[in-house]
């Protein structure tokens, strides 16, 4: 339905203040480094525009898309081309070209300095003082650190972190009720921003088919009593949602995520059982919870899938008449009955169908050549089983830290050109994997390991991307999207790697290690494991585990000395001197 | 946790009938789609047949079509294989097998849970 007016139509569909807060998401992801005044001055601006355009849709400029008001006014920066450089080139371009190369200097890693969190009591008077621009700058900060945080979602997150300041600082012991919600918003936000990365990912680097695929999979899973063509609309209303979140369309994207709820509500009879409690909760919360809703049980009767995958004499012929919709069919119908696979896996399982049957209708006997493409797919399924299972083994052996230390040194080993912050964040989220997963029943261990990896994977993906360094990890991140970790579970030690020189810089450490918080010494030493590994990539476990093992009990040493500093300055040499000898550098 | 117990094989001529019971305890079988498969002396196991959750859908290896019937009585807890018309070549030991989350009812790997085994012997 066409409006004459689509700022109008956008702003009288979600109201005003959500008009405004996905204004400022927007454009603190693509103007990253602007600081937050500025933003406040253009989100207002755009604001009262949108609202001369409700009030007569055809007033001037009122029929412009988006895209060219929202470019328009963020080409007015004035210290555009001083702060981002060849950015600034975007602005000299027309419409849709212009968004796109936004898009494509967005910022996985901005340079901006951490986040420190202010003392509780610091918090709570801003947040009593200002209450509307102590959550804008909440939106602003995670905006434009998190570029592709999914918008609608990011609403969400503002809402509970709202409730949390009002709650807790009213509380008698602020920090007790404050810090432990605002470190589960912490985590959660993070989790939730890799996901979406994925996504968009997937739709940026793979294709629309890619997302889909994923999307039939996993919605397979969730919903299994539902029918395919109720799938497939889900699948379609889904695809075009993230696609405009991953493509900057905000306002249309948490319009078209909050239809899709309005529908899955209306239609939870045909869909699943699970839904009932979601759809009786408010709109962000509801879209929230509909993401998240666990799977509906499996129907009581679902005959086996050879019948019309494999014996069927049509197969070819239903293959050819409309090879998605066949495949779409399969993944379909083998993911419902599977909610204890990753999507990862059921889609490695559909690639294969789809091959055999690529090779096999086109052979003389078609029948006989794909009788037994299900053989295929055993050893498919136990790689993933038989990895999951060790690794949770060597979790439960290890205790989450080591386990971390593990993968550090396999991933340093595996790709050690990657810079070791990257290597520090990628192997520390994969060691996650451990307490996320392995306390699952079986049935449930794969879905959630596997495809938490192929999250965390993409981390590595996109980071390497910006700066690429690794022949090896772009070949892992570009062949295949389902066959990332497959793929960096098969890589060795890289044999051409040229060991870094030795630097004692590196292996300097000071008395500030001593007030540091548990994670970030835990980050401290695992910086130091890797930039051992780095100089002697062939150390053996027990060599590097020795020099770990020094190194811990020489923090600890001098974190309860007298004289940290001096503390840390002569016996620094000593340990850099025995872990020299100890790695033969 | 489902624990597997089958029972009924033995001796028979070829021509003969046997009925083979698989007893479950520990979880609800209706859950599970249930499948018999045997395995012949020096040779790989093999699929013979399964019945889906509810016992609405049978699936059989073409060697044993028209000849085995499986079925199920969920309030017995408990699954079933008629054996008519055997031949020496249906000599093996015979495996009940329960699966959660079976899609392909004829793959030994989509098997969650198997019991020890009963011994068909088919000999004149």
């Known amino acids: 339905d066409a409006h004459k007016s689509e700022v109008a139509h956008r702003f009288k569909d979600l109201g005003e203040e959500n008009f405004k807060a996905l204004v400022l998401i927007a454009f603190a992801q693509y103007l990253q480094q602007c600081p937050f005044e500025d933003h406040v001055k253009l989100v207002n601006e755009v604001t009262e525009f949108a609202k001369t355009c409700v009030a007569d849709e055809s007033a001037e400029n009122c029929d412009k898309s988006l895209h060219t008001l929202f470019g328009d006014k963020l080409c007015t920066v004035a210290t555009l081309r001083e702060t981002y450089g060849e950015m600034a080139d975007c602005c000299a371009k027309q419409e849709p070209e212009r968004n796109e190369c936004f898009l494509q200097h967005k910022d996985d890693n901005p340079n901006l300095p951490r986040l420190v969190r202010p003392e509780v009591d610091v918090m709570c008077t801003a947040f009593h003082d200002n209450e509307e621009t102590f959550l804008k700058k909440y939106l602003y900060e995670i905006a434009r650190r998190h570029p592709y945080f999914y918008a609608p979602e990011l609403l969400f997150f503002a809402k509970r972190y709202k409730a949390a300041f009002t709650e807790c600082c009213q509380a008698a012991d602020k920090a007790a009720c404050l810090l432990p919600k605002l470190d589960e918003l912490r985590d959660e936000g993070k989790a939730s921003s890799a996901k979406q990365r994925l996504k968009c990912a997937s739709l940026q680097k793979f294709g629309e088919r890619a997302f889909k695929a994923w999307a039939v999979a996993r919605l397979s899973q969730r919903f299994p009593k539902a029918e395919f063509a109720e799938v497939s609309k889900l699948v379609t209303d889904l695809t075009k949602v993230h696609t405009e979140c991953c493509h900057g369309d905000l306002l249309e994207c948490a319009d078209d995520r909050a239809d899709l709820a309005k529908y899955i509500c209306e239609n939870q009879d045909s869909i699943s059982s699970k839904l009932k409690e979601c759809c009786e909760k408010p709109l962000l919360e509801k879209s929230h919870c509909i993401a998240e809703v666990e799977n509906d049980e499996m129907p009581a009767d679902l005959p086996s899938l050879a019948a019309d995958f494999v014996e069927s004499k049509d197969v070819c012929k239903n293959y050819a008449e409309a090879k998605d919709v066949f495949l779409g069919m399969f993944l379909y119908e083998y993911a419902r009955r599977h909610p204890d696979y990753s999507v990862v896996l059921l889609l490695r399982l559909a690639k294969t169908y789809e091959t055999t049957l690529e090779k096999c209708c086109a052979a003389a006997d078609p029948h006989e050549c794909y009788a037994k493409v299900f053989d295929e797919f055993k050893p498919l399924v136990e790689e993933p089983q038989n990895l999951i299972k060790q690794n949770c083994e060597l979790f439960e052996q290890l205790g989450e830290y080591k386990f971390q230390n593990a993968l550090l040194v396999r991933y340093t080993k595996k790709v050690p050109q990657v810079s070791t912050p990257t290597l520090v964040e990628v192997s520390r989220n994969l060691g996650k994997v451990g307490s996320k997963c392995c306390k699952h029943p079986e049935a449930k261990r794969m879905p959630c390991a596997e495809d938490y990896l192929s999250v965390v994977l993409n981390q590595l993906c996109v980071l390497h991307e910006k700066t690429p360094v690794s022949d090896r990890v772009t070949k892992c991140c570009t062949e295949s999207l389902v066959n990332r970790r497959p793929c960096f579970s098969a890589l060795e030690v890289d044999e051409t790697y040229v060991p870094k020189e030795f630097n004692a810089e590196t292996f300097t450490f000071h008395a500030d290690i001593c007030t540091l918080s548990e994670k970030e010494r835990q980050i401290k030493k695992q910086t130091a494991l890797v930039e051992l590994v780095k100089h002697k990539p062939k150390a053996t476990k027990e060599q590097l585990k020795a020099v770990m093992d020094d190194f811990a009990a020489f923090v600890e040493k001098c974190c309860k000395a007298d004289d940290k500093e001096t503390c840390f300055a002569e016996e620094g040499k000593k340990l850099v001197a025995a872990s020299q000898a100890a790695l033969g550098l | 946790e489902v624990q597997l117990v089958e029972s009924g094989g033995g001796v028979v001529q070829p021509g003969g009938s046997l009925r083979l019971s698989c007893a479950a305890s520990g979880s609800n079988i209706s859950s599970y789609v249930m499948g018999w498969f045997r395995r012949a002396p020096g040779k790989e196991r093999e699929f013979v047949a399964a019945?889906?959750?509810?016992?609405?859908?049978?699936y059989y290896a073409d060697s044993v079509k028209g000849r085995f019937t499986i079925s199920r009585d969920n309030s017995k807890k408990t699954a079933y294989l008629q054996m008519n018309s055997l031949r020496p070549e249906d000599t093996a030991l015979y495996y009940c097998a329960a699966g959660r989350y079976s899609a392909w009812y004829s793959q030994s790997y989509e098997y969650d849970y198997w019991g020890q085994g009963t011994l068909v012997t088919v000999s004149s």
């Open positions: 019945i889906s959750r509810s016992g609405g859908y049978t």
